[in-house]
Amino acid sequence: DVNEAPQFSQHVFQAKVSEDVAIGTKVGNVTAKDPEGLDISYSLRGDTRGWLKIDHVTGEIFSVAPLDREAGSPYRVQVVATEVGGSSLSSVSEFHLILMDVNDNPPRLAKDYTGLFFCHPLSAPGSLIFEATDDDQHLFRGPHFTFSLGSGSLQNDWEVSKINGTHARLSTRHTEFEEREYVVLIRINDGGRPPLEGIVSLPVTFCSCVEGSCFRPAGHKHHHHHH
């Protein structure tokens, strides 16, 4: 009669929790039985983020630190079931903690928009397109951002119109701009729960152009045309 190692009740274990659960929340549990009927002690291995603890007797797993889905989900740790007494044989399974996203990242520009320019003087109103993103997960649909000007004083000179859930168009309202840089503030709302808003700045230069590029004295880079 050979002593056998404990047997987990499942192949692996999974649990879904919101990433903003309070520290100390029970996030899951594992169970195993010993073929000889010995008591079992549970432990965790590979908890590299230090997020979890396990009750050695019950197999209940609790959070001991703030969880963050953006650090990677599912979070996978090994669970070990060891006989108490006897030969102390052990078995290993896995516990996967699936972190459900909470809207906790404000929108931002998807790339670096330095170098935007219009050739001065404008012969007609101009426009440019920009893209927004955030670091939240958007299950079942893409992000649905809404866009508006960041301050009322900008509305005489600029207007912003939504193209789709991630892109918008910034247009001039007239052609009477000075030959200088304008910083246009854009308010981006993600429509999430709770809604988060980001205010981003688009620097737009009105400059004399040579062959379609912003003319700069020697030592300055040429800007690329964006409208």
Partner: antibody, heavy 116, light 107 residues
Framework: QVQLVQSGAEVKKPGASVKVSCKAS????????MHWMRQAPGQGQEWMGY????????EYNQKFKDRVTMTRDTSTSTVYMELSSLRSEDTAVYYC?????????WGQGTLVTVSS | DIQMTQSPSSLSASVGDRVTITCRAS??????LAWYQHKPGKAPKLLLY???VLESGVPSRFSGSGSGTDYTLTISSLQPEDFARYYC?????????FGQGTKLEIK
């Protein structure tokens, strides 16, 4: 990036054995269990078993228990699946796959043909 | 062993259509379910796990639902690259088993 590269196609006679290899790269080899599946022509996927590379623990589908052996070589990050006493119905594409919740990375498959 | 019964076995649809594939387990698998897409000559691709969670990099037109024994894969608006075979698979306990697959063809 994660890659699982399997050995090439094999033609075997009934009663022989075949050993298919699966070389892992792009991740910590010992940290993920490796499973083996097969798909016979016109059939669905069939799970054969898995090996835990860190402990060498194996668990096999009862259907193959007496004929399959899974091993690993941690020095080369390679797992092996050997199937013995081959018969014509073992003709299939054999896959290794990395375990997560489901199988997130698969090898390209190895066709094993059993024919007299 | 837990049996996985998938339906339909084949399905014809057009680009832009909404498509639903169902998978029934012979006993409660508590959302320990994955869905795969498989194209000829290629390795299967994980689409969803835990019944509803989209694998990283998978388009959001794919979604999953269900609990207990009954599960559904939905493609909200078919794209040309979606025509393939789809499998469900449980990982609740060994032996792990797959559905027989649903072949999604162009109408």
């Amino acid at each position: 990036q994660v890659q699982l590269v399997q050995s090439g196609a094999e033609v075997k006679k009934p009663g022989a054995s075949v050993k298919v290899s699966c070389k892992a790269s792009g991740y910590s080899f010992s940290s993920y269990w490796m499973h083996w599946m097969r798909q016979a022509p016109g059939q669905g996927q069939e799970w054969m078993g898995y090996i835990n590379p860190s402990t060498d623990y194996t668990e096999y589908n009862q259907k193959f228990k007496d004929r399959v052996t899974m091993t690993r070589d941690t020095s080369t990050s390679t797992v092996y699946m050997e199937l013995s006493s081959l018969r014509s119905e073992d003709t299939a594409v054999y896959y290794c796959a990395r375990s997560r919740l489901g199988f997130d990375y698969w090898g390209q498959g190895t066709l094993v043909t059993v024919s007299s | 062993d837990i049996q996985m019964t998938q339906s339909p076995s084949s399905l014809s649809a057009s680009v832009g259509d909404r498509v639903t594939i169902t998978c029934r387990a012979s006993e409660n698998i508590d959302s320990y379910l994955a869905w795969y897409q498989h194209k000829p000559g290629k390795a299967p691709k994980l689409l969803l796990y835990a019944a509803t969670v989209l694998e990283s990099g998978v388009p959001s037109r794919f979604s999953g639902s269900g609990s207990g024994t009954d599960y559904t894969l939905t493609i909200s608006s078919l794209q040309p690259e979606d025509f393939a075979r789809y499998y469900c698979q449980h990982y609740y306990r060994t032996p792990l088993t797959f559905g027989q697959g649903t072949k999604l063809e162009i109408k």
